[in-house]
């Protein structure tokens, strides 16, 4: 079998809401993946599991099942949404994200995704990790790749 390539493209959109009484931020983050099947037979994308981390803490998880199949030598773009909650020990972010004197309230999140594919009863898992900028101050739609965080000073996970 040839490889199945998974490429994390980036954040597509982030929709934000707040709970003043709880000093809590809710971020619905939609991400885009490209999955390429380099084989001469179809493969099933069985599931996608994703999680988002902030300050080394998991703030959101999602799982999609029985997603799609990808034909021979074909590629499919898949969007998946992770609902995240920034609260309690991370509630210092509430002040930053709701501060009206700042135009862009970028925070750095770590996106982790694992894609499970199957073909002829064989299962394969491919994982990706990326740091991304997300604006927690307003609803934002991104150009693909626009939210990539490229700073070499990435925290040790």
């Amino acid at each position: 079998p040839r490889s199945i390539d998974v490429k994390y493209i980036g954040v597509k959109s982030a929709y934000v809401s707040y709970d003043v009484q709880k000093r809590t931020i809710y971020l619905n983050i939609t991400n885009t993946l490209n999955i390429t099947n380099n084989n001469y037979y179809s493969v099933e994308v069985e599931n996608i599991t994703a999680q988002v981390q902030f300050a080394k803490t998991v703030i959101g998880k999602a799982r999609l099942n029985n997603i799609t199949h990808i034909g021979p030598l074909d590629m499919k773009q898949i969007d998946y949404t992770v609902p995240t909650v920034i609260a309690e020990e991370m509630s210092y972010m509430y002040d930053f994200c709701t501060l009206i004197s700042i135009k862009v309230h970028n925070i750095v999140l770590m996106m982790q995704v694992t894609v499970t594919t199957t073909y002829f009863g064989h299962s394969e898992q491919i994982s990706q990790e990326r740091y991304q900028y997300v604006d927690c101050g307003r609803n934002t739609t991104y150009q693909l790749g626009q939210s990539e965080y490229l700073n070499v000073l990435q925290p040790q996970q």
């Epitope: 300050a55 080394k56 210092y92 925290p155």
Partner: antibody, heavy 118, light 107 residues
Amino acid sequence: QVQLQQSGTELARPGASVKVSCKASGYIFTTYGITWVKQRGGQGLEWIGEIYPRSDNTYYNEKFKDKATLTADKSSSTAYMELRSLTSEDSAVYFCARSKGSGTGDYWGQGTTVTVSS
Amino acid sequence: DIQMTQSPASLSASVGETVTITCRASENIYIYLAWYQQKQGKTPQLLVYNGKMLAENVPSRFSGSGSGTQFSLKINSLQPEDFGSYYCQHHYGSPPAFGAGTKLELK
């Protein structure tokens, strides 16, 4: 105005336990956390842990996990820290503070002095 | 755990002078740093959090800057009430550690 009123000086024997209280007023108690900090002999500050009264979720510094227990009573807007198995190393001033998250205290109590002596 | 290194340990200055205190994190903490002032025998007071956000009722002569691993607190035109100890504290993950402190004394 926001105020945090801590209980008075505690004198305890080695091996005993003490419970320090921190009564909050001037804000909605369940909106913020309460963080606890230790200061020995006018030296540096050490974060012990914090509690979020809305959910009763607690976050501890590993170093203090077996030493301190944080609780909160929503009805009286009071947070408590119990220190157990006291030794001379626990003699210090203990502060409570309203937490903006992850130990960032924006309003502080006046401090409670705990002295452990036989 | 993330360690915070503060410098200098002590500093002498006169009223009206401008001073800068620095704080270094052992790893990237982005902008998530707070600064406190503590006067002798008193309770700590939050000055700055999220790197440069001034806390309530803090005079504008105080300013925080930096990101990543290097941060500084600048006090313009020192006033008599500014003398005391200053602590940095990261608030990126647990435990949120403090620096050892800087004692600012009147020259």
